[in-house]
């Protein structure tokens, strides 16, 4: 709100721009015939200090000189960096109701002289780009500071550009707008940056460079790859580059990888052969360029080329297992199962599996292809059968994996001993065993196989298995292991033509069952009572049931009930008890026990034995 200084003037000594820590004198003078009245003694000049448009101080007490009614001089000290506004006002003491009238104002800028610019760095992006330099200006000056970038070179080449820094913009980079060409490759150029403001000036040290020092090639473009004879492991990477490029750096990696393969290529001329690619793998390729073998800078990495290498025929062998069951008097059903190859073995999209089932002596052969990882056939029970499976993609098939079809649990002498299953954590079970005691043929391998103890489809829910070398006696099973589910686990010992197995049940985590078995009937036969029940539904078992308990007590009795504990067997659903008195009414119920504890009781049934009990 400063009028155009009609009433007077304000001046600053030594200047309106001062170094940090300096004092200044501000004089406020009224023009002739300006003032409150014809009595000069009633004119009072005051000085107000504003920072960011906010009044921060009345400098009435800082007067150092006063010509009553005409002019006053104030000394200001401890000014902070930046700009401070001072406004002189006229206060008419005989009219206290009127506010002071503005006379004039002045801005004082406090700052520092510029430091010599440092760390000059110049670049020219590409052979056809222009030279741009950047620098570190040093401490903020808080004043408008002009920077001049000067370049000099051979053949009296000179060039300069300017910019300024103030509180709104920063000047630490300038594009000179000139292009250095490759024919000046050996020439030396000098740049210098000069900084000037009202408090002083400074210059950088001269910075010397050559064409090669500053020209950063453009990143390669138009990147493509050609796979030789549709090979999945060999390809020629091609790209476009600026003409002067002599060195390239290539980096490539599978998309899910975290580390790059790096290659340096000299005089590649936009072409490089790669020989170690993985077939049927998504890769990312990038290229960088340099104009000189020893000096100069690398370009930025090119845009990525993302592509998938072609397929190659599968390698590796399938992990096969099987299940056999007799389905009538002279036929058996063989269900073959196998695990998918991992991507590095499949080397492409597996289109189908070739399955062969062969009777060795009669040379009967059944062959088929399937897209599934299982295959089932009914074959005669007689003869020695062998199975083989291979995986095929668009380029070919893997070598077939063979397995002899033997009676997996047929040889007691091959049965592993002391099989145990111990829960390790929520999702795995440690299975351990001892080798067969009197095997009449050498164990070639162990197979640990497991299935959930709940109803499932033979073909829809294949078994899970692990192959274990013959010198190992333990396996940690984790595939498809869920807490609170009981698994039947078999350890098979396989020789060339025989198999023996041992079974155990195990779970990874257990709770007490939700309920007890449901007693369905109590019958009396030959002075014994038979208790029949239905098993607890699988979801309510919550782990492996170790045993059932049958409780009974006389009706209305307050005594502790008697109980009979029976080993859990899924095939058993009745049990005899013989210690009940005839013509006494009893209440009976059942519970189930896991390693975590006992279930609540199942339903209660009353029964009064009639016959003579033991």
């Amino acid at each position: 709100n400063i009028d155009v200084c009609k009433l007077g003037t304000v001046t600053v000594q030594p200047a309106p721009v001062i170094p940090l820590g300096s004092a200044a004198n501000i004089s406020c003078s009224l023009n002739p015939k300006q003032g409150c009245s014809h009595y000069p003694s009633s004119n009072e000049l005051i000085l107000l200090k504003f920072v960011n448009d906010v009044l921060v101080e009345n400098l009435h007490g800082k007067k150092v000189h006063d010509h009553t009614g005409h002019s006053s001089t104030f000394q200001v000290t401890n000014l902070s960096l930046g700009m401070t506004l001072f406004v002189c006002k006229l206060n008419c003491s005989n009219s206290q109701k009127k506010p002071p009238v503005p006379v004039c104002g002045v801005e004082i800028s406090v700052g520092v002289a510029p430091e010599p610019p440092q760390n000059i760095s110049c670049v020219q992006e590409g052979e056809n780009g222009t030279v741009a330099c950047s620098w570190n200006s040093g401490k903020v000056t808080y004043l408008k500071t002009n920077y001049t970038l000067q370049l000099s070179g051979p053949n009296n080449l000179t060039c300069q550009k300017q910019c300024f820094s103030d509180n709104r913009q920063n000047c630490n980079r300038l594009d000179l707008g000139i292009n250095l060409s490759p024919d000046l490759a050996e020439s030396r150029f000098i740049v210098r940056v000069t900084a000037i403001n009202d408090l002083g000036n400074s210059s950088s040290l001269p910075h010397t460079f050559t064409f090669l020092d500053i020209v950063i090639p453009l990143p390669p473009w138009d990147i493509r790859i050609n796979f030789l004879n549709a090979s999945g492991s060999r390809g020629t990477l091609q790209w476009e580059d600026e003409g002067q490029v002599v060195l390239n750096q290539l980096r490539y990696q599978p998309l899910n990888s975290t580390s790059w393969n790096m290659v340096n290529a000299t005089n590649a001329k936009g072409k490089y052969d790669l020989r170690d690619l993985r077939p049927f793998t998504e890769y990312e390729f990038q290229i960088s360029s340099k104009l000189h073998l020893s000096g100069g800078s690398w370009s930025n990495w090119s845009e990525s080329l993302r592509t998938r290498t072609p397929e190659e025929e599968p390698v590796g062998i399938l992990d096969i297992w099987y299940m056999k069951q007799d389905i009538d008097y002279d036929r058996q059903q063989i269900s073959l199962f196998w695990k998918s190859l991992n991507p590095s073995e499949a080397r492409g999209k597996i289109l189908h599996y070739q399955v062969t089932l062969q009777e060795v002596t009669k040379k009967t052969t059944l062959q088929n292809t399937t897209r599934h990882t299982s295959w089932t056939r009914v074959i005669p029970r007689t003869g020695a059968w062998t199975a083989s499976v291979s995986a095929a993609n668009s380029k070919g098939a893997s070598a077939p994996t063979h397995i002899n079809i033997v009676d997996l649990c047929g040889t007691g002498l091959l049965a592993p001993h002391q099989v145990s299953a111990k829960s390790e954590n929520m999702d795995n079970i440690l299975v351990t065993w001892q080798p067969p005691k009197k095997a009449d043929s050498a164990v070639r391998e162990y197979i640990v196989e497991w299935r959930a103890l709940q109803p499932g489809s033979i073909t829809k829910f294949p078994p899970h298995w692990l192959r274990i070398p013959p010198d190992n006696m333990s396996a940690l099973i984790s595939e498809n292991i869920k807490p609170y589910i009981c698994y039947e686990i078999r350890v098979h010992a396989l020789s060339e033509s025989q198999g023996g197995c041992s079974s155990i049940r195990g779970d990874s985590k257990h709770k007490a069952p939700v309920s007890g078995p449901h007693i369905t009937a109590i019958t009396e036969k030959k002075e014994r009572l038979f208790i029949s029940w239905t098993h607890i539904p699988f979801p309510e078992q919550r782990g492996c049931i170790l045993h059932y308990r049958i409780y009974w007590k006389e009706r209305d009795s307050t005594a502790q009930p008697e109980l009979c504990e029976i080993q859990y067997r899924r095939s058993q659903n009745s049990h005899p008890i013989s210690s009940l008195q005839p013509r006494v009414t009893y209440v009976l119920w059942m519970t189930a026990v896991t390693a975590a504890g006992e279930s609540p009781q199942g339903n209660e049934r009353e029964f009064c034995p009639q016959g003579k009990a033991n």
């Epitope: 089932t376 299935r451 103890l453 489809s457 073909t459 829809k460 078999r490």
Partner: nanobody, 119 residues
């Protein structure tokens, strides 16, 4: 438990056709592997055909090409289409379902339906 009910049997002339049906009820959530068996008078029960959860089928050699097994999951039913029937196909035909619990196979049987091939 699972209950199986066959139907569709009867008397047919040699060269004729019949379609047997089997409908499952009860706890059938895990019954995916369905079979047909037959038992001729004075002979042991023999496997005829099966169909798996993935609709893969297999047949007794002597009926292969003449009989076709199929299923309709929405109706919990399995069918045996029998063409070019011969007198030696005369038997009681049984529907069978198998499921596995651990390593134990549970089997369920229907009561059978009589097929007689005679002129």
């Amino acid at each position: 438990q699972v209950q199986l009910q066959e139907s569709g049997g009867g008397l047919v002339q040699p060269g004729g056709s019949l379609t047997l049906s089997c409908t499952a009820s009860g706890s059938i959530f895990a019954i995916d592997d369905m079979y047909w068996y037959r038992q001729a008078p004075g002979k042991q029960r023999e496997f005829v055909a099966y169909i798996t959860a993935t609709n893969s089928a297999n047949y007794l050699d002597s009926v292969n090409g003449r009989f076709t097994i199929s299923r309709d999951n929405a109706k919990n039913s399995v069918y045996l289409q029998m063409n070019s029937l011969k007198p030696e196909d005369t038997a009681v035909y049984y529907c069978n379902a198998k499921q596995i619990v651990g390593f134990q196979i549970d089997e369920y049987w229907g009561q059978g339906t009589q097929v007689t091939v005679s002129s």
